[in-house]
Interface confidence: low
Amino acid sequence: EEELQVIQPDKSVLVAAGETATLRCTATSLIPVGPIQWFRGAGPGRELIYNQKEGHFPRVTTVSDLTKRNNMDFSIRIGNITPADAGTYYCVKFRKGSPDDVEFKSGAGTELSVRAKPSAPVVSGPAARATPQHTVSFTCESHGFSPRDITLKWFKNGNELSDFQTNVDPVGESVSYSIHSTAKVVLTREDVHSQVICEVAHVTLQGDPLRGTANLSETIRVPPTLEVTQQPVRAENQVNVTCQVRKFYPQRLQLTWLENGNVSRTETASTVTENKDGTYNWMSWLLVNVSAHRDDVKLTCQVEHDGQPAVSKSHDLKVSAHPKEQGSNTAAENTGSNERNIY
């Protein structure tokens, strides 16, 4: 009679994580008598997966009834597959011996490859806010996927970004992999409502990529522009001066009025108006009693935005006998006005 052969018909089997793997094995003869064992790997360090004769293997079930005398199907199912289960599995026939069974013949092996989905991408931005025109870095990380092949793309408001670098760890063979990507994004003044998206595509996702997002509202700081204006006279000896604080983000802002360098009033932006681009506007006014001043008055609107160094605009009031319509001050920040608004 022809000598027994151990047939493993599948050179490779591909299974998704969490599913059940079926590893097929048949023998061509009932002789010699002896049990079948399944191993992962070959050589002295091989790992026992299933022993027909003895042992407890809760994840393994046999496809057919191995207790039947004429059974030659030794296929097994392994449940709840994880990436750690990847490897080459061998179906090995033993010959009954005394005191121990002797290995008789092995199948050619079946390579089990596990497909594991990547975790949801986590996008993180810089620790500190940055202003428009600056370049900031965003990182995207995803873990636990297999096989190693993966595609990562970056988008800003739907537009694909090109300035990024991606690495997959580890470089060599592993049960599962992680991806780490860093993208560089140039901020603009209109980015308060912008989003950066990291998109990961993998064979396990069946064409439906995973996305992680970061809102640039958490990254950007848009510094305010200031304009100090003198309003028409309300009363005989009073002048109303307003400070327009425009296009700033985030809302955290404190404004201080100074008269000739002395603090007159400090207030925090509360009732702001929001612009379409997500930035804010705010206005503060100061009523100055001119009769209380014998000399010229230098009014300064000083703004501290989001913990940054203060910026200011100044406006000169000239104390004089005759009221006159006032203009607006457009002098540069941190400098006094070149034109003097006379009152």
Epitope: A84, E141, Q165, N167, V168, D169, P170, V171, V175
Partner: antibody, heavy 115, light 110 residues
Framework: SVEESGGRLVTPGTPLTLTCTVS????????MHWVRQAPGKGLEWIGI?????ATSYATWAKGQFTISKTSTTVDLKITSPTTEDTATYFC?????????????WGPGTLVTVSL | QIVMTQTPFSVSAVVGGTVTIKCQAS??????LAWYQQKPGQRPKLLIY???TLASGVSSRFKGSGSGTEFTLTISGVESADAATYYC????????????FGGGTEVVVK
């Protein structure tokens, strides 16, 4: 070989940049790491710079350190040192372009942060 | 994140004896593990990588074993020159990692 420089005594909050100068191999072929060791303590990995210039940092090091490079040097900037940053700082070459092992180490450079 | 735990913290050995140091990974890292030797005032030196492969020029008295989450460094025929601190390091990945090294094991040779 790799050699670190720039270690010195600084006051807390004073930014400090350490430089790692490499020779005998190209930074376009190998990832580079920074590792530190506080006096009497163990090795602490800070971060890596890959061949293309991308960086990764230990969770505790993000925001505190910045790694950058030129064609022959790798810099580690300690943005705002505290006394807890007192340590010997080592530059180490990875064994490949990517993360795995550290097979060439510099002798280290000592940074002391004190008032 | 992967955390590496080394035991013991310190171990004494006699010349000619055997020392065993263990390293445990919080996650399965396959064979992505290295061992380093560091003598006082010196830079670390790579001894073993891929869990069991001896680095160039390293004595065969050093042996690495293990895979998955449990790893062992064995020093046989201990010599006085083996007095040092030994560190394990996972080479698996660095995403969300606090430290890639174990805490270290000091070997004192008597």
């Amino acid at each position: 070989s790799v050699e670190e420089s720039g270690g010195r005594l600084v006051t807390p909050g004073t930014p400090l940049t350490l430089t790692c100068t490499v020779s005998g191999f190209s930074l376009s072929n190998y990832a580079m790491h920074w590792v530190r060791q506080a006096p009497g303590k163990g090795l602490e990995w800070i971060g890596i710079i890959y061949t293309g210039g991308a960086t990764s940092y230990a969770t505790w090091a993000k925001g505190q350190f910045t790694i950058s490079k030129t064609s022959t040097t790798v810099d580690l900037k300690i943005t705002s040192p505290t006394t807890e940053d007192t340590a010997t700082y080592f530059c180490a070459r990875g064994d490949r372009d990517g993360y795995a092992y550290f097979n060439i180490w510099g002798p280290g450079t000592l940074v002391t942060v004190s008032l | 994140q992967i955390v590496m735990t080394q035991t013991p913290f310190s171990v004494s050995a006699v010349v000619g004896g055997t020392v065993t140091i263990k390293c445990q990974a919080s996650h399965n890292i396959g064979s992505w593990l290295a061992w380093y030797q560091q003598k006082p005032g010196q830079r670390p030196k790579l001894l073993i990588y891929d869990a069991s492969t001896l680095a160039s020029g390293v004595s065969s008295r050093f042996k690495g074993s293990g895979s998955g989450t449990e790893f062992t460094l064995t020093i046989s025929g201990v010599e006085s020159a083996d007095a040092a601190t030994y560190y394990c390091q996972q080479g698996y990945g660095i995403s969300y990692v606090h430290n890639v090294f174990g805490g270290g094991t000091e070997v004192v040779v008597k």
